[in-house]
Interface confidence: medium
C-alpha cells in the first residue's frame, strides 16, 4: 500500500499521528469499529505529552480510548505493551465494578472529565478518539 503522508480532512495532526475527535457517543465496540473502517484505531496513549494533547481536545467529556480488558489482561488495540506503557488511571481505578446493575464488570477504559482514566461498562455511549500514524502503509491497494 501507499504511505500516508498527511492527515485526512477534519483530522488533527500531532507528532506524526492523525487524530479524529467524535462529537457523538457510541458503545466501545462501535467506536472501535468506526475507527477501523477509517483505517485507524481508537487512540493509544503512549506518553504524558500525548495525554495532554488528547485531553486538550476532548474537554471535560467521557471519551473512549483504545484500551480494554475484555479478554482478561488490559490490552491496547494496536498491540502497545500495557504493563510497561504510560498509564493515567484515577485513584483506585481500574476497579472492574459490578455494582452498576448492567451486568458484568467494567472492561473498557475512557478519559473522564478531568482527563484521568476509568474503566466502565463498554456499552455506555461515550465519545471516542480515532488515531492513525503518518508514514504507515495504508490498506488501499496500489494504483496500477
Amino acid at each position: 500500500g501507499s504511505e500516508r503522508t498527511c492527515c485526512p480532512v477534519n483530522w488533527v495532526e500531532h507528532e506524526r499521528s492523525c487524530y479524529w475527535f467524535s462529537r457523538s457517543g457510541k458503545a466501545w465496540a462501535d467506536a472501535d469499529n468506526y475507527c477501523r473502517l477509517e483505517d485507524a484505531h481508537l487512540v493509544v496513549v503512549t506518553s504524558w505529552e500525548e495525554q495532554k494533547f488528547v485531553q486538550h481536545h476532548i474537554g471535560p467529556v467521557n471519551t473512549w480510548m483504545g484500551l480494554h480488558d475484555q479478554n482478561g489482561p488490559w490490552k491496547w488495540v494496536d498491540g502497545t505493551d500495557y504493563e510497561t506503557g504510560f498509564k493515567n488511571w484515577r485513584p483506585e481505578q481500574p476497579d472492574d465494578w459490578y455494582g452498576h446493575g448492567l451486568g458484568g464488570g467494567e472492561d473498557c477504559a475512557h478519559f473522564t472529565d478531568d482527563g484521568r482514566w476509568n474503566d466502565d461498562v463498554c456499552q455506555r455511549p461515550y465519545r471516542w478518539v480515532c488515531e492513525t500514524e503518518l508514514d504507515k502503509a495504508s490498506q488501499e491497494p496500489p494504483l496500477l
Epitope: 462529537r23 457517543g25 476532548i58 467529556v61 455511549p125
Partner: antibody, heavy 121, light 107 residues
Framework: QVQLVESGGGVVQPGRSLRLSCAAS????????MHWVRQAPGKGLEWVTA????????YYTDSVKGRFTISRDNSKNTLYLQMNSLRAEDTAVYYC??????????????WGQGTLVTVSS | EIVMTQSPATLSVSPGERATLSCRAS??????LAWYQQKPGQAPRLLIH???TRATDVPARFSGFGSGSDFTLTISSLQSEDFAVYSC?????????FGQGTKLEIK
C-alpha cells in the same frame, strides 16, 4: 474576570444581512471554542453555531446552514456571526458563549448579555 | 438529534421548600448534562455540568443527579433569588441540545 459583550443587533428586513460581534476579555480567547446560541421571544435556548479555538472547524444548526457564517479574530479577541438572507424565524436574542473545551463541543461556562435581532418588514 | 424534555413546564414552590426539576433525554447522554439558570432579561448562568458538578460560586443547595437519560436538579431550600427559568443541556451527542426550560415561580 471573564467578559463577553455582544453588539450589532437591530431591526432588519427579511432577506437582508446583519453582522454580530462578540468582544471577549478576561481570558485567553484563542484557547477556547466559542458559540452563538439564540433564544426566540418566550422560547427556550437554541444552539446556532460553533467554532474551534483556531477557527479551523465550524459547525451550524441545519436551519442556518448556507446563510450564517461564524468566524473569529484571535488577534482582536472577537467572535463574529455574519447573518445573510434573514428570515422572520431568526428573530431572537443572540448570545455569545464560551465553551469549556477548545473545540466547542461541551457546555457553556460563560455567556454574554445578548443582542436582539428582529427580522420584520 | 437528541430531544431534551423538561418537566414540569412551571413549578410553584414556597421559599424555604425543596424544588425538584426533571430533564429527560430521548436517548442516553451518559453523564454529559448541564443545567443553567436564567432570570428575566439576563443571560443564562451555568449551574451544573457533568450531571452533578457545581460550577464556580454556585451554592451547595443546588444538586444534580441522574445518568443515562433521566436527570434531576434539586434546590434544597429555595431562596428568593432562585426563582427563575432552569434549562438542561446535553453535550454527549452532536449537536448539543437544550430542554425547553422549567419556570420556577413563588407559590
Amino acid at each position: 474576570q471573564v467578559q463577553l459583550v455582544e453588539s450589532g443587533g437591530g431591526v432588519v428586513q427579511p432577506g437582508r444581512s446583519l453582522r454580530l460581534s462578540c468582544a471577549a476579555s478576561g481570558f485567553t480567547f484563542s484557547s477556547y471554542g466559542m458559540h452563538w446560541v439564540r433564544q426566540a421571544p418566550g422560547k427556550g435556548l437554541e444552539w446556532v453555531t460553533a467554532i474551534w479555538y483556531d477557527g479551523s472547524h465550524k459547525y451550524y444548526t441545519d436551519s442556518v446552514k448556507g446563510r450564517f457564517t461564524i468566524s473569529r479574530d484571535n488577534s482582536k479577541n472577537t467572535l463574529y456571526l455574519q447573518m445573510n438572507s434573514l428570515r422572520a424565524e431568526d428573530t431572537a436574542v443572540y448570545y455569545c458563549a464560551r465553551d469549556r473545551s477548545i473545540v466547542g463541543a461541551t457546555y457553556f461556562d460563560y455567556w454574554g448579555q445578548g443582542t436582539l435581532v428582529t427580522v420584520s418588514s | 438529534e437528541i430531544v431534551m424534555t423538561q418537566s414540569p413546564a412551571t413549578l410553584s414552590v414556597s421559599p424555604g421548600e425543596r424544588a425538584t426539576l426533571s430533564c429527560r433525554a430521548s436517548q442516553s447522554v451518559a453523564s454529559s448534562l448541564a443545567w443553567y439558570q436564567q432570570k428575566p432579561g439576563q443571560a443564562p448562568r451555568l449551574l451544573i455540568h457533568g450531571t452533578s458538578t457545581r460550577a464556580t460560586d454556585v451554592p451547595a443547595r443546588f444538586s444534580g443527579f441522574g445518568s443515562g437519560s433521566d436527570f434531576t436538579l434539586t434546590i434544597s431550600s429555595l431562596q428568593s433569588e432562585d426563582f427563575a427559568v432552569y434549562s438542561c443541556q446535553q453535550y454527549n451527542d452532536w449537536p448539543c441540545s437544550f430542554g425547553q426550560g422549567t419556570k420556577l415561580e413563588i407559590k
